[in-house]
Interface confidence: medium
Amino acid sequence: RAPRCRELPAQKWWHTGALYRIGDLQAFQGHGAGNLAGLKGRLDYLSSLKVKGLVLGPIHKNQKDDVAQTDLLQIDPNFGSKEDFDSLLQSAKKKSIRVILDLTPNYRGENSWFSTQVDTVATKVKDALEFWLQAGVDGFQVRDIENLKDASSFLAEWQNITKGFSEDRLLIAGTNSSDLQQILSLLESNKDLLLTSSYLSDSGSTGEHTKSLVTQYLNATGNRWCSWSLSQARLLTSFLPAQLLRLYQLMLFTLPGTPVFSYGDEIGLDAAALPGQPMEAPVMLWDESSFPDIPGAVSANMTVKGQSEDPGSLLSLFRRLSDQRSKERSLLHGDFHAFSAGPGLFSYIRHWDQNERFLVVLNFGDVGLSAGLQASDLPASASLPAKADLLLSTQPGREEGSPLELERLKLEPHEGLLLRFPYAA
């Protein structure tokens, strides 16, 4: 008799793929644009990325550092009208893209939560949650919660409002903290909260360090759903050298949880390559004319247009990984087991019941390495085969689909491999 199938876990929409943050509408759309109507025209692009949710804004009225002149129910006219927003919601829904609204109150000011009148601000947030839930948004984000006094209790209250409206609504909190204890204390009192933090922001050094950060986090959070990013708002290039971007894309898409990206992460958008552009929100490079300040600064391979035409580009890798992440059971909700593969390497298996299984091997180092995969670290339910098929490599040159002998696996510097193998009873 065939073994019984494992019961599928309840999956919320944010479990099924990546979230895409557009914190600065104007930078995302480029010179002379930057409103909700224009964003509507970019939804097809978001669809092509196979992302499940768009984290938008803040877009509400906010007079810098002025509580009275901050209205979370009103859209800043520079971004458009309530009608424009409704129209964006409708269009997004048709394309199966959920919209999460950032309600960080004082986003133009020094302290995102103002320095005084905490209760007034918290009441404004409460009212805004109810208002925008009625308007049809799929969730909310609040950032910089380390600046919010009694953050845990406020988050619990806001979570109740959000979940009380529908279990299908999401609350994301963001913090600049990278301290695991602080992160855990925020998560403790908020069961379904999705938390973005700087926890992984200094992980770029070695495979061992990244492995220990990831495994510590997963062990500490138990079976609760995680999100994976390098910060609450900033681009990957703020933290990573260019040669590690592909590796991190592969890792973020294949860890158990929701990967969260900022606009531009899919093309390796880098403010440092665009003189004068703000680190937090450089202009999105749709094509070579997107940054006219210094025309020659942008080459085709830095842009969406150029990378869309190149199957070996970072954007093409992002699209492939996003596609895999959203359709493979083992990546959607599979178990995770990290195991030793040698110095400089981080490797793990994702598996779910009798579905196809995935092996990820990441070389964070500057030198080519032979992987000594220590299958003895793995439980019997996740044992390694002798060979696995190469689904993709972050580096060009390997023949995809070819079976690789796991005992003789050699990785190039900064190379990541995604391999697949079948369940064997």
Epitope: G32, P275, G276, Q277, P278, P292, I294, P295
Partner: antibody
Framework: QVQLVQSGAEVKKPGASVKVSCKAS????????MHWVRQAPGQGLEWMGI????????SYAQKFQGRVTMTRDTSTSTVYMELSSLRSEDTAVYYC??????????????????WGQGTMVTVSS | DIVMTQSPDSLAVSLGERATINCKSS????????????LAWYQQKPGQPPKLLIY???TSESGVPDRFSGSGSGTDFTLTISSLQAEDVAVYYC?????????FGQGTRLEIK
């Protein structure tokens, strides 16, 4: 009126570091970029890099990568340029220069409408 | 890097006469998307910082006397002083801002004959 006032002349030994300041007044500091340009005695002008006043992001000319650090303090409307591992060929007048802003497009083409008076840095053993 | 080459290195012109300084870039600084030439001209007098005269190859900075004009496109540019005045004695620099690093010409010294 709009002006940039730089710190005074410095004499340094090879291998040392120098930090030059540039205080802006008469305009909204955070709306403009600031650049550093140097000029060796009797020589031409050499662009060193840029700091975006609003966000502090920087971009340095390749030649100075690893040796130059540009920072800013918005509370005092001041930018700083620190050059380390000084050698005799770093002897020059160092200028801060405000990047132009096109008020119609809010783009920042990199030419310089306001300059500091210059700071002479002499590197000598 | 884009190399900017000025000619001549020095120039002596009589008061009231026309002075012409040339600047050549190693690659075009004309941007096809907006048809702008990313080139500026500066004047530097002894002991002073440079002063912006012309940008976009031909747009005069406000307050600059209208005897100063800029022309050219692509790789070849000219700064013209239609009627030289005594206060125009200085070194003149062209600068490209088409690409980083920003680069300047080596300078042209203008004197009175």
């Amino acid at each position: 009126q709009v002006q940039l006032v730089q710190s005074g002349a410095e004499v340094k030994k090879p291998g040392a570091s120098v930090k030059v300041s540039c205080k802006a007044s008469g305009y909204t500091f955070t709306s403009y970029q600031m650049h550093w340009v140097r000029q060796a005695p009797g020589q031409g002008l050499e662009w060193m890099g840029i700091i975006n006043d609003k966000h502090g992001s920087t971009s340095y000319a390749q030649k100075f990568q690893g040796r130059v650090t540009m920072t800013r303090d918005t509370s005092t409307s001041t930018v700083y340029m620190e050059l380390s591992s000084l050698r005799s060929e770093d002897t020059a007048v160092y200028y801060c220069a405000r990047g132009y802003e096109d008020s119609n497009t809010h783009q920042h083409p990199i030419f310089f409408d306001i300059w500091g008076q210059g700071t002479m840095v002499t590197v000598s053993s | 890097d884009i190399v900017m080459t000025q000619s001549p290195d020095s120039l002596a012109v009589s008061l009231g006469e026309r002075a012409t300084i040339n600047c050549k870039s190693s690659q075009s600084v004309l941007y096809r998307h907006n048809n702008n030439n990313y080139l500026a001209w500066y004047q530097q007098k002894p002991g002073q910082p440079p002063k912006l005269l012309i940008y976009w190859a031909s747009t005069s900075e406000s307050g600059v006397p209208d005897r100063f004009s800029g022309s050219g496109s692509g790789t070849d540019f000219t700064l013209t002083i239609s009627s030289l005045q005594a206060e125009d004695v200085a070194v003149y620099y062209c600068q490209q801002y088409y690409n980083t690093p920003i680069t300047f010409g080596q300078g042209t010294r203008l004197e009175i004959k």
